[in-house]
Interface confidence: medium
């Protein structure tokens, strides 16, 4: 039986009975928040072989192993993930081992096993046999390995039953529990699965099979399942569904949406049966099962019941996400906020049309209006008193309206009003008059030339770069020395730089008045010698990366005809030199015959240039006889199992401090103090843990039904 669309078992362990007849869970499986320790021995679900999404276990008291519950769980497909993970085991207080001894494949996603105070047999599982890449796995805060004394079957009797693999240069036996080995297929099978008797399965099988080389005997399918057969692609007139099986049109038409009774039914798009048209597509009929592309972003009209929508926080802006036409008036009043410019762009950046007026007042957090990056029409159907449809009042840090070289904005009806915007140059306002077609509509007092731009460098001269030199992680630039009318008014220069993959950045991108700024800033003092051109060495840059750079002169607030003079450069785009790439990731090797090795890897995370080829080197190594002489009984006495507290053992997260030879004598030194990079990595690690935990809690704690 296929169960779904996701099973959530919480509070009462007897709900597990819902899994009784499931062979495949089409969706996720949550088992969580069972606070009373129960005896799970009577619960066993041998039919369950596949979970198409993810498995999440959280705070289930009394459960000591998953092996008895799910003895035949073979594949977790990870079609949809829980925060990038296909298997999450979190805060399972009594879990002693995972024990999923038939788990052979996690098709997509990583694993997260964290804060399980009594959990052992983690170092004995070779996850690389189950997952394609193990680099994203997160296994921390469990019982420290040295307190576990994990023994694989037969090792105490010197008759080891399990096979060995190498993990982190440690060649050891692989098992799930004290009596269950980790299954490995013969190298002759390559990437194929195998039967219990080590015969190779059909290439379309995944995980395991009941008979060799037979596409109807698979436990799970590598690609798709259709009419009892594993197939590489869905046959004609059938459609991919939930990432694992093929269904016909009638099946797709008959699915009731689990998520919304308002759904108009599933659609067929690009060979797949799905709940809704994907982003950028729209149904071609209310009864239609087919999608057609939208022209541009799919239009969405949003309307405010009270006619005027006040944007005074990110939360209020969030209501406008995806809107392309706003029916009503926008009142923007952003006094403070964190990373406000990019948040506003995220939520309001698709708005193209406002049917009423736009009013921006007391928005001291705004430096630019570029977050309304698609606004092209203000209809002015409703206007403020005085017939204003664009009104900008008292915004202490507003410096730019839009980048008028790349912006067409029309104000169909109504006038503009600007007052008390001390950093907004009048020339910027005049430019807006021309672009928007409002020139001639405003009366004299509508654009105040005394209190707009009174604290800005409005009459800007252009600074010219004179030289640029690059290396793999440095850029040296110099520019002409700026000479204002009175040399004493020049204080210093500020260099702004940031990564810019495309040549489309503006000075105000991601910038707000509350400290958020996507630009890095460096102050440059004036060279003491008046004939030396100012310059700077930017270091710590990434190789083979394009940067945008511009320079501003910092001048005294010297008033000349009501305004301050200043200077800045155009934005310069410059790429650092290529460098040696970082190491290739996830290197795997397997032998498929007595004379061949297959080596597979993923590209480096930092190519640092255009990769043109890889160099593969290999050498023959003598067999290590020690491996055969190793005797488990000669190990140090296995430590008594102390109950761990589930907090994270620093040793697990960071490697043990290395002892080094000091001076001429052999003796251990103290561990070196942590570098800034290590401290930063630890900080990020802690932050990442918090983010995940918040995500987990937000996802699973829901209000009780009424």
């Amino acid at each position: 039986e296929i169960c779904g669309p996701g099973i959530d078992i919480r509070n009462d362990y007897q709900q597990l009975k819902r899994l009784e007849n499931c062979t495949v869970i089409e969706g996720y499986l949550h088992i969580l928040l069972i606070s009373k320790a129960e005896d799970y021995r009577s619960y066993r679900f041998p039919k369950l072989t596949v979970i198409t999404e993810y498995l999440l276990l959280f705070r289930v008291a009394g459960l000591e192993s998953l092996g008895d519950l799910f003895p035949n769980l073979t594949v977790i497909r990870g079609w949809k993930l829980f925060y990038n993970y296909a298997l999450v085991i979190f805060e399972m207080t009594n879990l002693k081992d995972i024990g999923l001894y038939n788990l052979r494949n996690i098709t997509r996603g990583a694993i997260r096993i964290e804060k399980n105070a009594d959990l052992c047999y983690l170092s004995t599982v070779d996850w690389s046999l189950i997952l394609d890449a193990v680099s994203n796995n997160y296994i921390v805060g469990n019982k420290p390995p040295k307190e576990c004394g994990d023994l694989c079957p037969g090792t105490m009797e010197e008759k080891p039953m399990c096979e060995k693999t190498t993990i982190n240069n440690e060649y050891n036996y692989r098992c799930w529990t004290t009596n269950r080995c980790q299954k490995m297929c013969p190298s002759t099978c390559g990437k194929r699965a195998c039967t219990e008797n080590n015969e190779c399965c059909h290439p379309e099988c995944l995980g395991s099979c009941s008979a060799p080389d037979n596409d109807t005997a698979c436990v799970a399918c590598r690609h798709y399942y259709y009419a009892g057969v594993c197939v590489p692609a869905c046959p004609p007139n059938t459609y991919r569904f939930e990432g694992w099986r093929c269904v016909d049109r009638d099946f797709c038409a008959n699915i009731l949406s689990a998520e919304s009774s308002d759904s108009e039914g599933f659609v067929i798009h690009d060979g797949e049966c799905m709940q809704e048209c994907p982003s950028g597509f729209i149904r071609n009929g209310s009864q239609s099962m087919y999608c057609i592309p939208c022209e541009g972003p799919c239009p969405k009209v949003c309307e405010e019941e009270k006619k005027t929508k006040t944007i005074d926080s990110v939360t209020s802006a969030q209501m406008l996400q995806g809107c392309t036409i706003f029916k009503g008036n926008l009142l923007i009043n952003i006094r403070r906020g964190n990373n406000i410019a990019s948040e506003l762009e995220n939520f309001m950046g698709l708005i193209e049309v406002v049917t009423g007026y736009v009013k921006i007042r007391h928005s001291h957090a705004l430096v630019s209006l570029s977050f309304l990056k698609n606004l092209r029409l203000i209809l002015g159907e409703e206007q403020l008193e005085g017939n204003y449809s664009f009104y900008v009042l008292d915004n202490q840090n507003l410096q730019q309206l839009w980048d008028w070289d790349h912006r067409n904005l029309t104000i169909k009806a109504g006038k503009m009003y600007f007052a008390f915007n001390p950093k907004l140059c009048v020339s910027e306002i005049y430019r807006m008059e021309e672009v928007t077609g409002t020139k001639g509509r405003q009366s004299k007092g509508d654009i105040n030339t005394r209190n707009n731009g009174e604290r800005a460098s409005c009459e800007s001269d252009v600074l010219h770069f004179t030289s640029t030199t690059t290396s793999k992680n440095r850029i040296i630039i110099t520019w002409h020395r700026y000479r204002p009318p009175d040399y004493r008014d020049l204080i210093s220069f500020t260099v702004y730089y940031k990564e810019a993959p495309f040549k489309n950045v503006t000075e105000y991108d991601g910038q707000d008045a509350c400290g958020s700024n996507s630009w890095n800033m460096v102050d440059v003092d004036l060279p003491p010698n008046k004939d030396v051109e100012p310059g700077i060495l930017l270091h710590g840059l990434k190789p083979w990366t394009q940067y945008a750079v511009y320079v501003k002169a910092v001048t005294l607030t010297m008033v000349e005809n009501d305004h301050i003079r200043g200077a800045k450069s155009e934005i310069l785009y410059i790429r650092t030199n290529a460098s040696v790439p970082s190491i290739p990731l996830d290197v795997l090797s397997a032998s498929n015959s007595s004379s061949q090795l297959i080596v597979k890897w993923n590209p480096p995370s930092l190519p640092n240039g255009n990769l043109s080829y890889y160099i593969v080197r290999w050498q023959r190594q003598p067999q290590d006889g020690y491996l055969y002489r190793h005797n488990y009984c000669s190990k140090d006495k296995i430590p008594i199992r102390k109950y761990a507290d589930g907090t994270i053992d620093i040793e697990e997260v960071t490697e043990n401090p290395k002892t080094e030879v000091c001076g001429g004598e052999k003796g251990p030194c103290c561990a070196c103090p942590k570098t800034e990079a290590e401290k930063q990595a630890e900080k990020e690690e802690a932050e990442y843990r918090k983010v995940f935990e918040n995500f987990l809690h937000n996802s699973i704690f829901v209000p009780r039904p009424e």
Epitope: Q287, I292, V301, I325
Partner: antibody, heavy 117, light 107 residues
Framework: QIQLQQPGAELVKPGASVKLSCKAP????????MHWVRQAPGQGLEWMGE????????NYAQKFQGRVTLTVDTSTSTAYMELSSLRSEDTAVYYC??????????WGQGTLVTVSS | DIQMNQSPSSLSASLGDTITITCRAS??????LSWYQQKPGKAPKLLIY???NLHTGVPSRFSGSGSGTDFTLTISSLQPEDFATYYC?????????FGGGTKLEIK
């Protein structure tokens, strides 16, 4: 509250055309298909066609194909239905209505079109 | 076109009664059936959509069931405001088609 506003009545001559409006404030106009249904005096309900305000895709009942045209103006959240070559049997109340789960959730109050010379 | 056969065409009942109206489709329409109530001179009102989902604001004495070709609307404990004409509508394939209607009258 979603409400669809339609004019009360239209009197037209046979052979002429009529263009009915349906103003749709109070909801995201482009999020729902707009349908047109008519009801002749003392008769049942008859579906004429639908349009998607977000991309102007239309689907018509075969019976009205060629005679009916559905359009929208998203800036004013108004849908229009134009019926041409009118005959006396087109005398009916014409409703605009928006969809929900392939049903018609909200209805205008209807426009009575009388075709008479 | 899919034909919708609604029965009975008229029905008399008393306050507090439970009544059932049926709608039969000429072919499988899955669960794409909705029910409407119309009073004289007024626009129809949606009661049930997708065969069994109660529309917002509709009293719980209205219920719908069925799938495939046979569907029923049940009104339990009839109230004075329930006396009206009821229509079913199929949304499985174009064109949308209505049943002929059932006029519910007070006995």
């Amino acid at each position: 509250q979603i409400q669809l506003q339609q004019p009360g009545a239209e009197l037209v001559k046979p052979g002429a055309s009529v263009k009915l409006s349906c103003k749709a404030p109070g909801y995201t106009f482009t999020s729902y298909w707009m349908h047109w249904v008519r009801q002749a005096p003392g008769q049942g309900l008859e579906w004429m066609g639908e349009t998607n305000p977000s991309n102007s895709v239309t689907n018509y009942a075969q019976k009205f194909q060629g005679r009916v045209t559905l359009t929208v103006d998203t800036s004013t959240s108004t849908a229009y239905m134009e019926l041409s070559s009118l005959r006396s049997e087109d005398t009916a109340v014409y409703y605009c209505t928006i969809g929900r789960g392939r049903g018609f959730a909200y209805w205008g109050q209807g426009t009575l079109v009388t075709v008479s010379s | 076109d899919i034909q919708m056969n609604q029965s009975p065409s008229s029905l008399s009942a008393s306050l507090g009664d439970t009544i059932t109206i049926t709608c039969r489709a000429s072919q499988n329409i899955n669960f794409w059936l909705s029910w409407y109530q119309q009073k004289p001179g007024k626009a129809p009102k949606l009661l049930i959509y997708k065969a069994s989902n109660l529309h917002t604001g509709v009293p719980s004495r209205f219920s719908g069931s069925g799938s495939g070709t046979d569907f029923t609307l049940t009104i339990s404990s009839l109230q004075p405001e329930d006396f009206a004409t009821y229509y079913c509508l199929q949304g499985q394939s174009y064109p949308y088609t209505f049943g002929g209607g059932t006029k519910l009258e007070i006995k």
